[in-house]
Every structure is written in structure tokens, then in C-alpha cells.
């Protein structure tokens, strides 16, 4: 796994942003904006919500999701799980990479039924060419997207 | 936007820390310590709360703020907004880069009057030479600065 | 402190994961998995919970801990402190680098006595060869480890 940075190479990096189409409700991963505004791909590609690795190496991957609601919807578990997962051709199931669990609904106060919370994940993982990383949030109904600055997903080679 | 890392160049990086003078109360951004303790600037400069880019490129920018209080002061919205914003000569207004909203006041319980919460933001953005990045917190009164380890602001080129 | 990246050198990086043995209850730092699963060391070493620096430079260090509980244990302050600390041969005591305080116990709701919260820290610090970085959580009884994806500790040179 020796990894070199050659001075003539571009270092792979990406930052993808939340958009109205991010929440599919299909049970799949979140989808992301790749070009408009702050979003970009450099030395990485994108497919159906996934960052796709072109060049093997160690990557710092990160995601933030903005959560918000009014009280806690009925039938919604009080635990929200936000995670980064790897898809690899060598294994049939997604692999958990970085995961957080939060209980944000308890944040509604007597003076304010509206609550907001944010979940940030970041860490270094080794990724092979062709492997994919996706973001999942359960329950995604509480994710607030708005303008791409509050929920996002990115990576860069270290 | 092809960006190369030449082996003889220093990679721009900075870590700025909270200080007693960080909260201005003027509606401006937070101000930061740039030299003492853990704070440093390397290939970036600082002006009135802003990290100023010397060399164009993609930067991982980050900020953490420590929030704390007893209950929630009246006149203080129960939502706290913590964000990283860009100032560019090409546009008159600040542009949101990375933003979080939290509702920390709901954390005070009968068994504990004092609550603490922390907000972390980090992500990769493209910055041109001369552009500036600042941190804002609304309401800034709830930010705990003190010793420089709990609230901070930094960046490095990726 | 001029730091160069030579193209033939490997960039130091590490990602350590939580394991059943992480919580010692001895008042020491958290211990980590260094080899299995997602854990790795590259250009850094490990000793008794500490990442040990081999090559001096600026490092982005990070840690996430998953917190969880049922209500709040009696005798536990509602404040949880999660921090990254430096041990250096030149100074007898640990130095705080990055610290967060949270009040997660207040998150238990009437509909759910179980609560979850996550604390993320990350920032750039200068580390000399031989210096060590450790993670501490007070009260560590609330740290939830499980499978190495929820609580972790890492670093990479920038």
C-alpha cells in the first residue's frame, strides 16, 4: 500500500452538495450535486450517489448532514444513523466505514418545538480503484438540504 | 483549475484559535489568535478574522465552536447558526460555504442547568488568491473561547 | 518549521478504530485497534493508546467518539469531555490540543430513555518526532465502541 505523491500529478479531491433531488425515499443512498455552485470532482468520478475512486490510495472522506424537524414524527425512531459506506466489486454488501448515531428529537424545548442538529463524519480509509463510497441517513426524512452548504459529502487523497 | 504540488513548495496551512478578543459583539465575524500557543499561519495570511488565500487552490477548511449556557437567554433564537463564509473581491456579499444549525438550548435538564454543545464544520472548497474565509456564529454570546482548544478555525491545501 | 513534501516520500497517515479493549477504566487514554479491519498505520507508530510521530510536521489530527446511554448515570456530571492531547518529552503534563464538551444526557426524551450523540474533533497541529497524541473521554463509560466505525482516531500530514 505504498502511496506516492508525484509532483506532476493532480491530487484527487471532491466536494458534493445537497440538492432537492438528494432524498430519493427509495431506501437508496443520498444523491448529490456534482457541478453547480460549490460542488466539484477532481480525479474522482460520481455515479448514483457514489464517489467512485479512480486512483487507489488513502482518502480522507467526510460528510455532514443537517437534521431538523418539528418535534419527532410518529413512527420515527428517536435514533438517526448517518454513515459513509463502501461498495466494492469484491464483496456483495456495503461495508460501514464511518458511522454516527444521534438522538436529535430530544432537542425540542418547551419554548421551541422546532429543533436543528448537525452530524459530521470524517476519517481516512483506503480505497481501491473502482470502489465507491456513499452516504446514508436513516431516517432521511429529517435531512434538511436547502442550498448545498448544510449537507454535503467529499473526499481527498492524503 | 489543475493544481500541482511541487515537491519544493510548502503546503499552505493554518490553525487559528479562540481568544478573549474573539467576540466583538459588532456583528462582524469571530476574531482569532494567529501566533500564540497552538495557532500558526503557513502560506496563508490573516486580516480582521479572515484567513486570506495567497495561493489559489482547493482547501479543506474547518471550524469548531464550543457552545455553552445556562438555559437559553431570551432574545436568543433557539437556533444557533455556525458557518464558514467566503469574501471575494468579485462579489459584494459574503457567500455561504459550510453551515450548521443547532438547537443546543434544549439540552439543559432538571438534573443539569448547564448545557454544552459543539459544532464542527469541514469541507473542501476552491479559493482564489486574495479571497478570504471567515467564521460567523449567531448568537455569538454562546461561544466559549477561553483557552483556544475548544473553538478554532483552520485550513490546508489538498 | 518549513516542511517539504518530497515526491518519493510516503505521506504519514493513520486511522485507528475502537475495539472492546479500548475502554480501560484506569483513567488512562482510550486504546485503539491498529491493524484489523479499517485500522492502519503508515509512517506513524502506536504505543499504549498514542499515535507516535516519526516525522516532524503539521498534522491534521481527528477523533470521533460515539456516546450513548439510558438516562444519565448517577454521579456522572452531565458534561462529557472529549479531547485530543499531546505528550511531549519536553513537558511533564499532557497538553490539550482539541477539546469538546457535550451534554448528551439531556437528549433522552419522554418517548425514549435511550439517547445517542457523537463528538467529532479535527484540526491541524505541529508535532515533533517522538511526540505522542492520545484521546481521552471523561466519562468514558458513555463511549459506545461496537465495530470500529463509530469511535476512531486518526491523523495525516498536511
Amino acid at each position: 500500500l505504498i502511496q506516492e505523491r508525484r509532483s506532476h500529478e493532480v491530487n484527487p479531491a471532491a466536494h458534493l452538495t445537497g440538492a432537492n433531488s438528494s432524498l430519493t425515499g427509495s431506501g437508496g443512498p443520498l444523491l448529490w450535486e456534482t457541478q453547480l455552485g460549490l460542488a466539484f470532482l477532481r480525479g474522482l468520478s460520481y455515479h448514483d450517489g457514489a464517489l467512485v475512486v479512480t486512483k487507489a490510495g488513502y482518502y480522507y472522506i467526510y460528510s455532514k448532514v443537517q437534521l431538523g424537524g418539528v418535534g419527532c414524527p410518529l413512527g420515527l425512531a428517536s435514533t438517526i444513523t448517518h454513515g459513509l459506506y463502501k461498495r466494492t466489486p469484491r464483496y456483495p454488501e456495503e461495508l460501514e466505514l464511518l458511522v454516527s448515531q444521534q438522538s436529535p428529537c430530544g432537542r425540542a424545548t418547551s419554548s421551541s418545538r422546532v429543533w436543528w442538529d448537525s452530524s459530521f463524519l470524517g476519517g481516512v480509509v483506503h480505497l481501491e480503484a473502482g470502489e465507491k463510497v456513499v452516504v446514508r441517513v436513516l431516517d432521511e426524512r429529517l435531512v434538511r438540504l436547502r442550498d448545498g452548504t448544510r449537507s454535503y459529502f467529499g473526499a481527498f487523497m492524503v | 483549475l489543475i493544481q500541482e504540488r511541487r515537491s519544493h513548495e510548502v503546503n499552505p496551512a493554518a490553525h487559528l484559535t479562540g481568544a478573549n478578543s474573539s467576540l466583538t459583539g459588532s456583528g462582524g465575524p469571530l476574531l482569532w489568535e494567529t501566533q500564540l500557543g497552538l495557532a500558526f499561519l503557513r502560506g496563508l495570511s490573516y486580516h480582521d478574522g479572515a484567513l486570506v488565500v495567497t495561493k489559489a487552490g482547493y482547501y479543506y477548511i474547518y471550524s469548531k465552536v464550543q457552545l455553552g449556557g445556562v438555559g437559553c437567554p431570551l432574545g436568543l433564537a433557539s437556533t444557533i447558526t455556525h458557518g464558514l463564509y467566503k469574501r471575494t473581491p468579485r462579489y459584494p456579499e459574503e457567500l455561504e460555504l459550510l453551515v450548521s444549525q443547532q438547537s443546543p438550548c434544549g439540552r439543559a435538564t432538571s438534573s443539569s442547568r448547564v448545557w454544552w454543545d459543539s459544532s464542527f464544520l469541514g469541507g473542501v472548497v476552491h479559493l482564489e488568491a486574495g479571497e478570504k474565509v471567515v467564521v460567523r456564529v449567531l448568537d455569538e454570546r454562546l461561544v466559549r473561547l477561553r483557552d483556544g482548544t475548544r473553538s478554532y478555525f483552520g485550513a490546508f491545501m489538498v | 518549521l518549513i516542511q517539504e513534501r518530497r515526491s518519493h516520500e510516503v505521506n504519514p497517515a493513520a486511522h485507528l478504530t475502537g475495539a472492546n479493549s479500548s475502554l480501560t477504566g484506569s483513567g488512562g487514554p482510550l486504546l485503539w485497534e491498529t491493524q484489523l479491519g479499517l485500522a492502519f498505520l503508515r509512517g506513524l507508530s502506536y504505543h499504549d493508546g498514542a499515535l507516535v510521530v516519526t516525522k516532524a510536521g503539521y498534522y491534521y489530527i481527528y477523533s470521533k467518539v460515539q456516546l450513548g446511554g439510558v438516562g444519565c448515570p448517577l454521579g456522572l456530571a452531565s458534561t462529557i469531555t472529549h479531547g485530543l492531547y499531546k505528550r511531549t518529552p519536553r513537558y511533564p503534563e499532557e497538553l490539550e490540543l482539541l477539546v469538546s464538551q457535550q451534554s448528551p444526557c439531556g437528549r433522552a426524551t419522554s418517548s425514549s430513555r435511550v439517547w445517542w450523540d457523537s463528538s467529532f474533533l479535527g484540526g491541524v497541529v505541529h508535532l515533533e518526532a517522538g511526540e505522542k497524541v492520545v484521546v481521552r473521554v471523561l466519562d468514558e463509560r458513555l463511549v459506545r465502541l461496537r465495530d470500529g466505525t463509530r469511535s476512531y482516531f486518526g491523523a495525516f500530514m498536511v
Partner: antibody, heavy 121, light 107 residues
Framework: QVQLVESGGGLVKPGGSLRLSCAAS????????MNWIRQAPGKGLEWIAD????????YYADSVKGRFTISRDNAKNSLYLQMNSLRAEDTAVYYC??????????????WGQGTTVTVSS | AIQLTQSPSSLSASVGDRVTIACRAS??????LAWFRQTPGKTPKLLIY???SLESGVPSRFLGSGSGTDFTLTISSLQPEDFAIYYC?????????FGGGTKVEIK
């Protein structure tokens, strides 16, 4: 300047009532928690009640629960303590105190001069 | 209720002396502790908050330390105005409680 001035103390018989007032000036009263603390002659300090700034959440010490009522009027920059069913052991100097509770600043940093309540037959 | 036990309850010292007062909480209160000084006939004055933060305008000879259950107030060089009663107070948990006080007298 920042100031708290208590009034309303006096001599009252056991079982009687008194209403203490605390007038605030020089700061944004509505931003702060407010507390009542008392000190019996020759004794230490005893916290008796507080009221939040935001939603008027109130807590009392067990020794006064059900007998004393704390309230505030942010429009008038005033804090009150209605004391009913007074007992001899309620005899004390009563202080109101402002409490900071945000970010880097905590603690009861501003106290009134105190008003004396004597409960005696 | 959380009990705060101060020790000693009284002490005699001279101007210029270094004085240490301890405050022990019956359970963990993190850093939610304040120290007050009260001179006869006067209102209490906040010296230290959040266990170790010096209140604005308070001389630097006052030093607060500790967290969890054990706290200390140190006066590095006693001045004439420091002969008074000192109280610790926890603001972490209801009901708020004060220590019994430590009387610092002239030797």
C-alpha cells in the same frame, strides 16, 4: 451602571405574607437568569429560587417550595418574590442576583444590597 | 441535593500569606463551580466562575482550580481586604447549593 435594588422587606408575623421586589438597571434584564438567595443572621448563603430568562422556567429550594413564588416582568425590568405562610426560620437578608449563563461567562456576578425580612410574633 | 463541603471552616493567616481553601462536591459537577468573598455587612462578590475563570476586575492573586468533585481556591498573597468569608457554589444541578463557608481571620 449595572445595578439591582431590592425592596419590600420588613417585620411580619408567622403565617403572614410579603412581596419582595428587585429593580434592575444598566443591562438587558431579559437576557439573564435571576435568582433569590437568602442569608439568615450569622449563617451562610442559601439559594431559594431562580427564573429563566427565556420561558420563565422556575425552580425552588425544597425549604420554600409551595410557599414562595418567583416571577419577573421583563417589560418593567423587575424580579419579584411572593412569600406566603412565613415562618420564623425565613428570617434573613434576601438578595436578588443576576446570573450570566453563556459561552465564557457564568456565575452570579451582580447582587443587590439585600432587604431584611423578619418573621416574629 | 449536591452537598458542598468546605475546609477548613476557619483559618488564621497574615498579610502576604498563601492561603488555600478546599471545596468538595458530593457528586460530579464538572466545572460548574463559583467562589465568592463576603466581607461583614457587604454583599457577596464573585471571584471565580466555571471553577477556574477569574472574574473581570478581580485581582490575579485569586486562583481557582479543580473539576468533578474536588475544587480549590488559592490566594497567593493575602491582602487586608481578603479577611472575609469565602463560599463555593455549584450551578450545575438543582437545587443550587453553597458551601458552608470558610472564615479567613487575621492571625
Amino acid at each position: 451602571q449595572v445595578q439591582l435594588v431590592e425592596s419590600g422587606g420588613g417585620l411580619v408575623k408567622p403565617g403572614g405574607s410579603l412581596r419582595l421586589s428587585c429593580a434592575a438597571s444598566g443591562f438587558t434584564f431579559s437576557d439573564y437568569y435571576m435568582n433569590w438567595i437568602r442569608q439568615a443572621p450569622g449563617k451562610g448563603l442559601e439559594w431559594i429560587a431562580d427564573i429563566s430568562s427565556r420561558d420563565n422556567t422556575i425552580y425552588y429550594a425544597d425549604s420554600v417550595k409551595g410557599r414562595f413564588t418567583i416571577s419577573r416582568d421583563n417589560a418593567k425590568n423587575s424580579l419579584y418574590l411572593q412569600m406566603n405562610s412565613l415562618r420564623a426560620e425565613d428570617t434573613a437578608v434576601y438578595y436578588c442576583a443576576r446570573e450570566r449563563g453563556f459561552g465564557d461567562y457564568f456565575g452570579m456576578d451582580v447582587w443587590g444590597q439585600g432587604t431584611t425580612v423578619t418573621v416574629s410574633s | 441535593a449536591i452537598q458542598l463541603t468546605q475546609s477548613p471552616s476557619s483559618l488564621s493567616a497574615s498579610v502576604g500569606d498563601r492561603v488555600t481553601i478546599a471545596c468538595r462536591a458530593s457528586q460530579d459537577i464538572s466545572s460548574a463551580l463559583a467562589w465568592f468573598r463576603q466581607t461583614p455587612g457587604k454583599t457577596p462578590k464573585l471571584l471565580i466562575y466555571d471553577a477556574s475563570s477569574l472574574e473581570s476586575g478581580v485581582p490575579s492573586r485569586f486562583l481557582g482550580s479543580g473539576s468533578g468533585t474536588d475544587f480549590t481556591l488559592t490566594i497567593s498573597s493575602l491582602q487586608p481586604e481578603d479577611f472575609a468569608i469565602y463560599y463555593c457554589q455549584q450551578f450545575n444541578t438543582y437545587p443550587l447549593t453553597f458551601g458552608g463557608g470558610t472564615k479567613v481571620e487575621i492571625k
